[in-house]
């Protein structure tokens, strides 16, 4: 049990106050983290509170400003990037968001040696992506879907690609579906370690069906947004990978990297690229039916002036019980011999663990094992491997950082974080300097987040980088809810849950219950992290009990739980929420006449299906931007878990798992349906179809749309949304305003 200290004693009660909705909407209790921008083994950059860019040297203890806030302000820069030779800085301004990761911006290059902006051969605007080479000060950038190269910032650009075309051909940047569902980045180009080569992806969206929606704006006529967006079963982007020698870019031009034969025989995806050395690259490919992944190691052949990917360097990863990998197929971390690597994949017991691959996957050496999962490999040095896992004390929702000494035999394992601040910190990530000389630990909770700097050899804490003192002080007079993380054992399934309880919680009383659900494949909601958010307010001020439950399909507890939902989304996720609610009722402090459920995105889908389950458990519920039919969602995501919507594959379950099919069952619940009209991700179409089905079934419901808002419902819409949902829930639970 994790109980947040409420610090409430009778004598103090008058000075303590509950959280207000205003606190949440204003971000009054938001926290800060500190991630060093490492530039060497012992140096990092950080943007100070007054916007100076400061270089810190850990070993000398010295710091100095490399770029003043005055220079930043002169071009309204919101971001920066130092060239590896430390001669130039790019300054980013005019940020304009596109999709989840992508944005365009204007870039200025500042010459640190003479304190002036580089004049002549300035960069065009707006640029879709820009980055320095890993060594020196070459620049690669994407403009109007084409890639350009500059040997020096002041040089004229060399155009690498010429076929880029809006919504048709994307070079060096992903199209919508690759950005959102495969790469999770705004870029699709990768420098080799010393900047000799530049690899890039070309996405051809020519044959992809287009989603079109109105953007109302302020004009007399709305404009239409068109996005090539492959829905389940539709034609997918065609991807090709090229590599160009940046020293002699005109010599042989971009050379295509061959696709492994077993992948190329049918529809496929490119999933990631990892440089090993300047002349060795590793590409990962995935069949469209995403249970077979191939890792291909390719070598530069000077005699061919191109890339050779021998079959002997192809490693196949296949899942027989689900899809390949977790949410994504894991990426390899290469060791110093530049051919063997470490990778996370399922072991024979169905738990994701670190394996060492030297020749073949069949002969992989398992490095970690147990009924828990290795989650991320941070760094491999010559003598240590740093990774995170949820092993400690068997809480799947925790993250601790471990070090395995791979230089000695047998390798020994040490938990770096488990006992540092045990009550405060149970969920960590880390950021390592070159050669892991130093690292930063960022603790996200359950207590107030704290970021610290550590010595990479001794693990000794050097200093606190950010401890959120102001937040700690601000919370001193706040009645925070209590939180507990426990588990339910039901029919051989372990359901972990987090319960958020009102500050003066009394087990002998009855409380309204709100279930907050996400429940998507490979997600995790029950995590030991700090948050003061809307549900904290609902518990603190409105006296609700809020519960989050990780059911079947969720991550980091083994393949049995994860792959249980394979090819049948919308069944077990819903069942497990319902099962948990029944268990909560049995605990005796839930008012079973006042139970609600809400969720966003996948959570909106699950909450809708739970409301329409016909159990009579839920009085009301909210779905924000829900998926309503898997035929409406992106191919890459949907097919990973559902297969294809064809008769000879899984069409039947696609049809059976829609929200619309259950329209009649909404008759006895209060349903609030919410969606942004400019949602590029889960299209407004989803809610439009739910609404149509409910109208056709003559079922009453409430709805709210947010004009020109995307999947995030940001800005003023956020305030309106949470205010609206609060009113809805208070009305449902008969709580006075």
């Amino acid at each position: 049990i994790v109980l947040r200290p409420s610090r409430v004693h009778n004598s103090e009660e008058n000075t303590m106050r509950a959280l207000t909705l205003k606190d949440i909407l204003n971000g009054t209790f938001s926290y800060k983290t500190f991630f060093p921008n490492w530039i060497s083994g012992q140096e990092y950059l950080h943007q100070s509170a007054d916007n100076n860019i400061v270089l810190y040297n850990i070993e000398t203890g010295q710091s100095y400003t490399i770029l003043s806030n005055r220079t930043m302000k002169s071009v309204n820069a919101s971001n920066y990037g130092l060239s590896p030779d430390r001669q130039f800085v790019y300054l980013e301004s005019d940020y304009s968001k596109l999709w989840r990761y992508s944005y365009t911006a204007t870039y200025y290059i500042y010459d640190l040696s003479n304190g002036e902006f580089v004049r002549g051969n300035e960069l065009p605007r707006p640029i879709q992506y820009l980055c320095w080479s890993p060594v020196g000060s070459k620049l690669a950038y994407v403009y109007q879907n084409n890639i350009y190269l500059k040997q020096r910032p002041g040089d004229p650009p060399f155009q690498i690609t010429f076929n880029g075309r809006e919504n048709k051909i994307f070079n060096g940047i992903p199209d919508w579906v690759y950005e959102e569902e495969m790469l999770a980045t705004k870029y699709a180009l990768w420098w080799s370690p010393n900047g000799k080569f530049l690899a890039y992806a070309e996405f051809n969206d020519t044959d992809i069906p287009v989603i079109a929606y109105s953007y109302y704006g302020d004009e007399q006529y709305p404009r239409t947004i068109n996005i090539p967006y492959p829905k389940a079963g539709a034609k997918n982007p065609v991807v090709r990978i090229f590599i160009i020698d940046t020293t002699y870019p005109a010599y042989v031009g971009p050379q295509e990297v061959p696709v492994p034969a077993m992948i190329a025989s049918s529809d496929y995806y490119f999933s990631w690229l990892t440089w090993v050395t300047d002349e060795r690259v590793c590409l990962q490919w995935l069949k469209r039916v995403q249970n077979v992944s191939v890792l291909s190691i390719c070598d530069f052949r000077e005699d061919w002036q191109t890339w050779d990917c021998p079959k002997t360097q192809e490693h196949i990863e296949e899942s027989r019980t689900g899809w390949a990998g977790g949410f994504f197929v894991s990426t390899p971390v290469f060791s110093y011999d530049a051919i063997s690597y470490y990778k996370i994949f399922s072991d024979k017991d169905g738990y994701k663990h670190i394996h060492y691959i030297k020749d073949t996957v069949e002969n992989a050496i398992q490095i970690t094992s147990g009924k828990w999962e290795a989650i991320n490999i941070f760094r491999v040095t010559q003598d240590s491997l740093f990774y995170s896992s949820n092993e400690f004390e068997e809480y799947p929702g925790r993250r601790n950082i471990y070090r395995i000494s791979i230089g000695s035999y047998p390798p020994s394992k040490k938990c770096v974080t488990c006992h540092l601040r045990k009550e405060r910190c149970q969920y960590y990530t880390a950021s390592f300097s070159d050669y892991a000389k130093y690292y930063a630990l960022v603790c996200y909770g359950p207590g107030i987040p704290i970021s610290t700097l550590h010595d990479g050899r001794t693990d000794q804490e050097i200093k606190i980088l950010e401890e959120n003192k102001e937040l700690e002080n601000a919370l001193k007079n706040i009645q925070l809810p209590k939180e507990e993380i426990k588990k339910l054992e039901v029919d051989e399934i372990t359901l972990w849950y987090k319960m958020i309880l009102p500050p003066q919680f009394d087990r002998s009383k009855k409380y309204p219950l709100l279930i907050q659900v996400y429940g998507g494949p490979c997600s995790q909601s029950v995590r030991s992290v700090f948050a003061v958010n809307w549900i904290s307010y609902l518990a603190s001020k409105e006296g609700m009990v809020i519960a989050l439950v990780d059911g079947r399909g969720t991550a980091f507890q083994g393949d049995k739980l994860l792959y249980a939902v394979y090819r049948k989304l919308g069944v077990y996720e819903v069942e497990d929420q319902i099962t948990a609610v029944r268990k909560f009722i049995e605990m005796g402090f839930i008012d079973e006449k006042r139970i609600a459920i809400w969720g966003w995105s996948y959570g909106g889908y699950v909450s809708s299906l739970a409301l329409a389950s016909g159990t009579g458990l839920f009085k009301c519920g909210i779905a924000v931007a829900p998926v309503s039919s898997w035929e409406y969602y992106a191919s890459v995501y949907t097919e990973r878990f559902m297969g294809l919507p064809t008769k000879d594959d899984n069409l039947e379950h696609y049809k059976n798992s829609t929200v619309m099919a259950r329209a009649e069952y909404f008759r006895n619940v209060d349903y609030l349906l919410i969606h942004g009209t400019a949602d590029d991700n889960v299209h407004f179409q989803n809610s439009a179809q739910i609404a149509k089905a409910l109208v056709n079934a003559q079922v009453d419901f409430q709805a709210m749309w947010y004009s020109d808002q995307n999947h995030g419902l940001s800005g003023l819409s956020t305030n309106h949304l949470y205010t609206h949902m609060t009113h809805f829930l208070k009305q449902c639970f008969s709580l006075s305003d």
Partner: antibody, heavy 120, light 111 residues
Amino acid sequence: QVQLVQSGAEVKKPGASVKVSCKASGYTFTENIIHWVRQAPGQGLEWMGWIHAGSGSIKYAQKLQGRVTMTTDTSTSTAYMELRSLRSDDTAVYYCARHGGTGRGAMDYWGQGTLVTVSS
Amino acid sequence: EIVLTQSPGTLSLSPGERATLSCRASQSVSTSAYSYMHWYQQKPGQAPRLLIYLASNLESGIPDRFSGSGSGTDFTLTISRLEPEDFAVYYCQQSRELPYTFGQGTKLEIK
């Protein structure tokens, strides 16, 4: 036009060394690979190795490793092949050949050959 | 290393006839993009001359009576109508893997 002109014939004693030169013209020397191939009297062709004139990258055939050294002088666009500890079975015509630009391993221009005779 | 075996060792034909020379590799010399097999002609006292590169591409300046085909391990050089100057030794060579290797040669002689 592309030309590779090799040095003249040599007669060497066993145990000695020989250094054959190959002067290139008609193309950008540093952008390409020079291969060395030998042919014993009445026999087939044997690849000895290559040197990339620009990057200096070298690959040798395993059986000659330790006895052969390939170098270039970019100022004179000349490639050299030195073979040490000569034996009688090293008697052969030694050719330099240019690596074809698009051939990916084909040799499109050849020198006229240099006969090296190893005899006591 | 990849061993190339040429057949026949000697081929006796008359001018005007069609010549078919074969080269078999001990393992595949092809990738999804190319077949790394090349053909050369060598006349007595001369250096070899490139005829065909990457299995089927005719080197510039070579008469189009020469053609190459094949993939994987089996390759063929075809001379559609033999001319007197075509009688020579023909070598295949692979560049799929280092070390590069040559076949032992096929001698094409006048019948």
